[in-house]
C-alpha cells in the first residue's frame, strides 16, 4: 500500500531573467527513493538517480542546476517557462509518487520601465 505523500511548493511565480527552486518532499513512507525525474509538460528536464547521480537534459543544461537536495533550480527564466512541472518519485517497494508545481514567470516591472523611459 502507498502511504506516502508528496509536498510541493505549489503555485509559484518568479520574474523573467531570475531563478526559482522547484522543490518536492516525499513523506510518510519508509520506501526507498530509487530515482526522481523532473518533467515540464512532456519534456524530461533532469533525473536524479540514487546510485548514479544527476543527469540534465542537453536542451536545458545551461539553465538548469541540480539541487538543493532532490529539487531543481531553473535559471535565466523566460515567459516560455510558465507552466506545469512534475516531480516523479520512483520508490521501492511503494511505486511512483507524483507532485505538481505551477510556475508563472512574470515580466519584470523594472525591465518594462527601463524599456519605456529613456533618460535624455
Amino acid at each position: 500500500m502507498m502511504t506516502g505523500t508528496i509536498e510541493t511548493t505549489g503555485n509559484i511565480s518568479a520574474e523573467k531573467g531570475g531563478s526559482i527552486i522547484l522543490q518536492c518532499h516525499l513523506s510518510s513512507t519508509t520506501a526507498q527513493v530509487t530515482q526522481v525525474n523532473w518533467e515540464q509538460q512532456d519534456q524530461l528536464l533532469a533525473i536524479c538517480n540514487a546510485d548514479l547521480g544527476w543527469h540534465i537534459s542537453p536542451s536545458f543544461k545551461d539553465r538548469v542546476a541540480p539541487g538543493p537536495g532532490l529539487g531543481l533550480t531553473l535559471q535565466s527564466l523566460t515567459v516560455n517557462d510558465t507552466g506545469e512541472y512534475f516531480c516523479i518519485y520512483h520508490t521501492y517497494p511503494d511505486g511512483t509518487y507524483t507532485g505538481r508545481i505551477f510556475l508563472e514567470v512574470l515580466e519584470s516591472s523594472v525591465a518594462e520601465h527601463g524599456a519605456r523611459f529613456q533618460i535624455p
Epitope: 538517480n49 543527469h55 540534465i56 537534459s57
Partner: antibody
Framework: EVQLVQSGAEVKKPGASVKVSCKAS????????IYWLRQAPGQRLEIMGR????????YFVDKFKNRATITTDTSASTAYMELSSLRSEDTAVYYC??????????WGQGTLVTVSS | DIQLTQSPSFLSASVGDRVTITCKGS??????LVWYQQKPGKAPKLLIY???NLQSGVPSRFSGSGSGTEYTLTISSLQPEDFATYYC????????FGQGTKVEIK
C-alpha cells in the same frame, strides 16, 4: 567525429586487478560524463559506474562500489576503470560510453577481460 | 529498476523483409526508451532515442514506436548490413537494458 578507443584484451588470474583505458577524441572531454558498462557471456549489458571528468566525481552501482575505481586524465582525454579482486564471473567485455543527457550516444569498441586460473 | 524483456531473442529473416522487435517493461517506461544496434566485435550504435526519434545518420528504414510498457523497433526493409543484435534501454526508473535480439540471415 566523436571516438572512444579502448585498450586491448586482457587475461588475468583470480584475485588480480585489471585496468582498462578509454581515450576520447572529437569533443570536449570535460563536457560529458563517461560510463563504464560490461557484458558477460550470455548476459545483458549492465552499468558499473560513472565519472564526471569536469570534477572527477565518481558514482557506482552497489554491485561495484567496493571493487571498481574510475579515474580520468583530462590532459590526455582518457578515462580508466580498474576492477580488483577478479573472479571468473568478471569475465566479460567492458565498455566505456559517453552519456548525452540520459542515454549513451557513443561507445568504445569494448575490451575483453578473461579471468582464468 | 525497470526490467526490459525483448522478443524474440532470435530472429531469422531475409533481405527485404519487414522486421519488428518488441521491448516490454516491467513498469511504465514513459517513452524514455532507446534502441541500439551492435555488430560482433564492434561498439553499440545509437539508432533511436525517446521512443521514436531517429539518430542523425541512421537510415529511415529504422523506426520506433510505443508507449507505456510496450515498444517496438521496426526495420521496414532489411538490408545486408542490418544483420546484428539489437538492444533496448530505458531511463525512466534506473538505467537498464533488454537482453538483446539477434537478427540472423535466413
Amino acid at each position: 567525429e566523436v571516438q572512444l578507443v579502448q585498450s586491448g584484451a586482457e587475461v588475468k588470474k583470480p584475485g588480480a586487478s585489471v585496468k582498462v583505458s578509454c581515450k576520447a577524441s572529437g569533443y570536449t572531454f570535460t563536457e560529458h560524463s563517461i560510463y563504464w558498462l560490461r557484458q558477460a557471456p550470455g548476459q545483458r549489458l549492465e552499468i558499473m559506474g560513472r565519472i564526471d571528468p569536469k570534477n572527477g566525481r565518481t558514482y557506482f552501482v552497489d554491485k561495484f562500489k567496493n571493487r571498481a575505481t574510475i579515474t580520468t586524465d583530462t590532459s590526455a582525454s582518457t578515462a580508466y576503470m580498474e576492477l580488483s579482486s577478479l573472479r571468473s564471473e568478471d569475465t566479460a567485455v567492458y565498455y566505456c560510453a559517453r552519456i548525452d543527457g540520459f542515454y549513451f550516444d557513443f561507445w568504445g569498441q569494448g575490451t575483453l577481460v578473461t579471468v582464468s586460473s | 529498476d525497470i526490467q526490459l524483456t525483448q522478443s524474440p531473442s532470435f530472429l531469422s529473416a531475409s533481405v527485404g523483409d519487414r522486421v519488428t522487435i518488441t521491448c516490454k517493461g516491467s513498469q511504465n517506461v514513459n517513452k524514455y526508451l532507446v534502441w541500439y544496434q551492435q555488430k560482433p566485435g564492434k561498439a553499440p550504435k545509437l539508432l533511436i532515442y525517446s521512443t521514436d526519434n531517429l539518430q542523425s545518420g541512421v537510415p529511415s528504414r529504422f523506426s520506433g514506436s510505443g508507449s507505456g510498457t510496450e515498444y517496438t523497433l521496426t526495420i521496414s526493409s532489411l538490408q545486408p548490413e542490418d544483420f546484428a543484435t539489437y538492444y533496448c534501454y530505458q531511463y525512466n526508473n534506473g538505467f537498464t537494458f533488454g537482453q538483446g535480439t539477434k537478427v540472423e540471415i535466413k
